[in-house]
């Protein structure tokens, strides 16, 4: 966080929605009203929502927004029929622009978009679009919710009646009715190409007050595929002055957005003000807390058949208007701790948001490199009670990388957790990492300004003179469908080991190709001898949708003296490289493109060594690695076998078995569990209902005590 002293008065920041002045002689624009005395406000802290009422009395009113909409209490309003949209199917003109207001990112619409119907008193003209989002990995960011369900992003389109007012600002200042549409964005496994111009624009307004013209887009394509199911209620602006003048139209169905595209929102910066000190921070969680309904009634549209079908028509759509094909946001708080000289414990916390609860188990993948040999193993750790696993037989001179995926009941996976590095026998460790997409992996020291703090903190642990060092990688690593044919270790061999020698060295590359293309499906209970996989370079991965070679328009729309100090990279990486990330949640950034999924089809399926669950204590020796790695779920509640010599008694050890040996049978093994990794990315439940409930985890529920623990050493892959 950069702090600097400002000389202008502290309480002079404008409203998010303040639209006035001329912009290059055309129309209105968003401008911070530094001199007008509009009260400063923020989304947290001393000027946060609970304090808005101090300077904007309306914020304490009884008809405030946003609200949670309870479907079962919403009455069907016969007056709420089909929306009539006019101009929404046209491409936007090149005068449409985007601005980072410091509180949101706003799109100033320069074309004629009209809406009528839906009980609106007249024909309303669209003025601007604003966005609200969370902090990372699809966390809840919407302002409104349906049945308690919040979404990663909410887009709001604001309208005014041009027959009554010459401008949107006039309508607001005269406290007259305006219209607003709320559209939810939900996580999808694939990029939504309709959002490309918006995402591209976001990369041009990374910094507070930046402006950029937008590539043409079709506003209708940013709305849900079906507009028939919507809610209506009367509320307010969700930012000061909180005027209670808004006729809200909240669409039931979301629009898809990928994790990759979400990153563009999470990469936006703002400046915040405390006393006379300004700080540059990420603009995240820019949503107002929900307000009481009081005496209001929420209505739902009466469009025939819009509410009562089972979404199958939408689910056939490859993107799906209800987009999430992921189990949950990634597991968080990844940690790796040495237990002794030969064993590591990987631990994590439950994902913050679970789209398809419950989580039934976790898949732990770990990769290592030694003597230019790369290996990778994946195993499934049953259930969710004890969120840790022990990796035994750790070789002190290998570099390890760990990551975890949650698996939901319907076999969907979460995105991968942050990736953790572990290197034994190393006293120099990374002080920070920065993930940048490059064509060829390279390692080079990074300038101190380029550093981002490590989420778990750097740590060194020594036992019997052997120092262990580990560091977390600031990667989101892409969705579960991404990956390629190289292990992390293969890239690390050439790119990271050198970096370990640098004091404060940074990793300049972590391509998407560092994980295998296909992981076994969640139901897979087999283990396989990890086979070396060819390393590839980023060039093999299919370019991301924003990976074009044309420069961004960053700065095009800025006024004199406001041009970018440096332009965005072609790959759309964060512009603000010199600003360290704020905290651990800032880390989980995707710095990679999605590898070509076609490769998934070409890899041979490994055959299981036996149709049974992995035997307790049984595992396979990996050829070319003189000491095998046995991964076992940590069981602190009993049911352990005696530990082997030299090992922590808390750990289950294993008997080495030749690579071709079948697993031992043991009481309670489950012959019915399918053992074969499936080529199909999601074997069942991969439909995602528009109504699917998801759970945002209540920290109080994160109880890790537990019954019934299965200490079998996982289903080794």
């Amino acid at each position: 966080v950069l702090h600097y002293v400002v000389c202008f008065p502290a309480l002079t920041e404008g409203y998010v929605g303040a639209l006035h002045e001329n912009r290059h002689g055309s129309a209105v624009q968003i401008r911070r009203r530094k001199a007008s005395g509009d009260p400063y406000w923020a989304y947290s802290g001393a000027y946060g929502p609970e304090h808005w009422v101090t300077s904007s009395v309306s914020c304490g009113g009884r008809h405030q927004s946003p609200i949670d909409i309870l479907d079962q209490y919403a009455r069907v309003g016969e007056e709420y029929q089909e929306l009539q949209l006019d101009g929404f199917d046209n491409e936007s003109s090149n005068k449409t622009w985007m601005k980072n207001t410091g509180k949101t990112v706003a799109i100033l619409l320069k074309d004629d978009y009209f809406v009528s119907g839906a009980g609106l008193p007249g024909r309303f003209k669209a003025e601007k679009v604003e966005f609200h989002w969370g902090h990372s990995n699809g966390s809840a960011g919407s302002e409104h919710s349906i049945n308690g369900r919040r979404f990663p992003v909410e887009m709001q389109i604001f309208f005014y009646n041009p027959d009554d007012f010459d401008s949107f600002q006039t309508a607001i200042s005269e406290n007259r009715i305006i219209g607003a549409m709320a559209i939810f964005f939900q996580v999808s496994p694939r990029d939504n190409s309709a959002l490309d111009p918006i995402i591209h624009g976001l990369k041009g307004v990374v910094h507070h007050e930046k402006e950029t013209f937008l590539d043409p887009f079709v506003l209708r394509d940013l709305l849900p595929a079906s507009l028939g199911s919507y809610y209506r209620y009367t509320g307010s602006l969700t930012t000061p002055p909180c005027s209670e003048i808004v006729e809200w139209i909240v669409f039931r169905r979301p629009v898809p957005i990928s994790y990759h595209q979400l990153e563009a929102f999470y990469s936006i910066f703002t400046t915040e003000q405390q006393d006379h000190v300004k700080s540059v921070e990420y603009l995240r969680n820019n949503f107002r807390p929900q307000q009481r309904l009081h005496d209001r009634v929420v209505s739902k549209s009466a469009v025939r058949d819009s509410w009562n079908h089972d979404m199958t028509d939408f689910l056939e759509n490859p993107l799906g208007t209800e987009a999430s094909k992921v189990c949950s946001s990634p597991p968080i708080h990844m940690k790796v701790q040495p237990l002794n000289q030969t064993a590591l414990q990987v631990s994590w916390s439950q994902p913050e948001t679970i789209y398809h609860p419950p989580i039934m188990n976790y898949m732990i993948s770990y990769s290592w490199t030694k003597n230019e040999d790369e290996k990778e193993k994946t195993f499934t750790k049953d259930s969710d009670k004890d969120l840790k696993a022990t990796i035994s037989h750790v070789s002190p001179d290998s570099l390890y990388l760990f990551r975890v995926q949650a698996v939901c009941r319907n076999d969907m996976r979460s995105d991968f957790s942050q990736t953790m590095l572990f290197q034994a026998n190393t006293t120099r460790i990374f002080q920070g990492t920065r993930i940048v997409k490059t064509g060829v992996p390279t390692a080079s020291p990074a300038s101190s300004a380029d550093m981002a703090p490590i989420s778990s903190g750097s740590s060194t642990w020594t036992s019997s003179g052997i120092p262990f060092s580990f560091v977390s990688m600031a990667t989101g690593m892409g969705p579960s469908s991404s990956g390629s044919q190289a292990t992390v270790a293969s890239v690390v061999t050439s790119t990271l080991l050198a970096g370990l020698g640098f004091g404060g060295g940074g990793i300049s590359s972590f391509p998407s190709t560092v994980w295998p293309t296909r992981l076994p499906t969640a139901a897979s209970a087999s283990k396989q001898a990890a086979r070396p996989v060819l390393a590839t370079t980023e060039a093999l991965a299919s370019p991301g949708p924003d990976g074009d070679s044309s420069p961004t328009k960053d700065g095009e729309g800025t006024e004199e003296g406001e041009k970018d100090e440096k332009s965005e990279s072609e790959d759309g990486e964060r512009e603000h490289e010199e600003d360290g990330e704020k905290d651990s949640e800032k880390k989980e950034k995707s710095g990679v493109t999605h590898a070509a999924e076609e490769r998934n089809q070409t890899e041979p399926s490994p055959t299981p060594s036996s149709p049974n669950r992995t035997a307790e204590g049984g595992h396979q020796t990996i050829p070319g690695h003189e000491q095998d790695h046995t991964a076992v779920p940590t069981d602190q509640t009993g049911g352990r076998r005696d530990a082997g010599p030299g090992l922590d008694p808390d750990m289950v050890t294993s008997t080495q078995v030749p690579p071709t040996a079948t697993e031992e049978q043991y009481a309670g093994s489950d012959p019915k569990r399918p053992e074969m990794p499936s080529k199909k990315p999601m074997s069942r439940g991969d439909r995602f209902s528009e109504d699917s409930r998801f759970i945002t985890v209540n920290p109080a529920e994160k109880n890790t005590s537990g019954m019934i623990s299965r200490p079998a050493p996982g289903r080794m892959e």
Epitope: D71, Q72, N147, R149, D310, M311, Q350, I354, H356, P357, P358, I359, M360, N361, K381, D382, S383, D384, K385, D386, V407, C408, R409, N410, D411, T521, A522, A523, A525, P633, D635, G639, G668, S669, D670, K672, R673, P674, S683, R684, G685, R687, F688, S689, D691, S692, R693, I695, V697, N698, E701, N703, S705, G706, M707, I708, S709, R710, P711, A712
Partner: antibody, heavy 120, light 111 residues
């Protein structure tokens, strides 16, 4: 008031196809999962299968192949179809609403049950 | 599929404390829930997530777990507690997902 009720029970002949319906009220199948559980006279509870809020169905190992669970959200109904019934399928059949948490599932609301008797 | 084992019957004196156990043959790490069923009635959820009590369930009922055993404890047993008690848990994902009940314990309250 949230509740559910099973219907369709009665006397069936061996090899018949059994079709039971669970009608819910006060909550939506679009955001809730339903399990079917049966209990033979004098015996314990036996899970048959479930359908989650997105329409995915899951079955007990013994029920796979001859049981099908579907839903009609607009009608607020979940249907259990079981083919080739035998006397061993004689039981009271319950539908129960699942309480799905982040990391656990339990059955927090049960219908009164419907008795199915298989006899020639 | 895994099996949950419960004692077939347990007796307790009125006002005494009794513990009903549920042991898994293989150690699923899923949470256990407990159900009470009185004759001729549908089961009722007593305990979920090993230890949590739904609203309306008296605090005489408590749950715990250790290793591969979940335990339901009833303190100050009353005549109205006479019923069958079932533990349950879930396991697996996708086509291998299962929800499993224990065989049930018939609790008799004497005295």
């Amino acid at each position: 008031q949230e509740q559910q009720k099973e219907s369709g029970g009665g006397l069936f002949k061996p090899t018949d196809t059994l079709t039971l319906t669970c009608t819910v009220s006060g909550f939506s199948l679009s955001s809730n999962a339903i399990s079917w559980v049966r209990q033979a006279p004098g015996n314990g509870l036996e899970w048959i299968g479930a359908i989650d809020n997105s329409g995915s169905a899951y079955y007990a190992t013994w029920a796979k192949g001859r049981s099908t669970i579907t839903r009609a959200t607009n009608l607020n109904t979940v249907t259990l179809k079981m083919t080739s019934v035998t006397a061993a399928d004689t039981a009271t059949y319950f539908c129960a609403r699942e309480d799905v948490r982040a990391d656990s599932i339990d059955l927090n609301m049960w219908g009164p049950g419907t008795l199915v008797t298989i006899s020639s | 599929s895994f099996v949950l084992t419960q004692p077939a019957s347990v007796q307790v004196n009125l006002g005494q404390t009794v513990s009903l156990t549920c042991t898994a043959d293989t150690l699923s790490r899923s949470y256990a829930s407990w159900y009470q069923q009185k004759p001729g009635q549908a089961p009722v959820l007593l305990i979920y997530r090993d230890t949590s009590r739904p609203s309306g369930v008296p605090d005489r009922f408590s749950g715990s777990s250790s290793g591969n055993t979940a335990t339901l404890t009833i303190s100050g047993a009353q005549a109205g507690d006479e019923a069958d008690y079932y533990c349950a848990t879930s396991d697996g994902s996708g086509s291998s997902y299962q929800f499993v009940f224990g065989g049930g314990t018939q609790l008799t309250v004497t005295g």
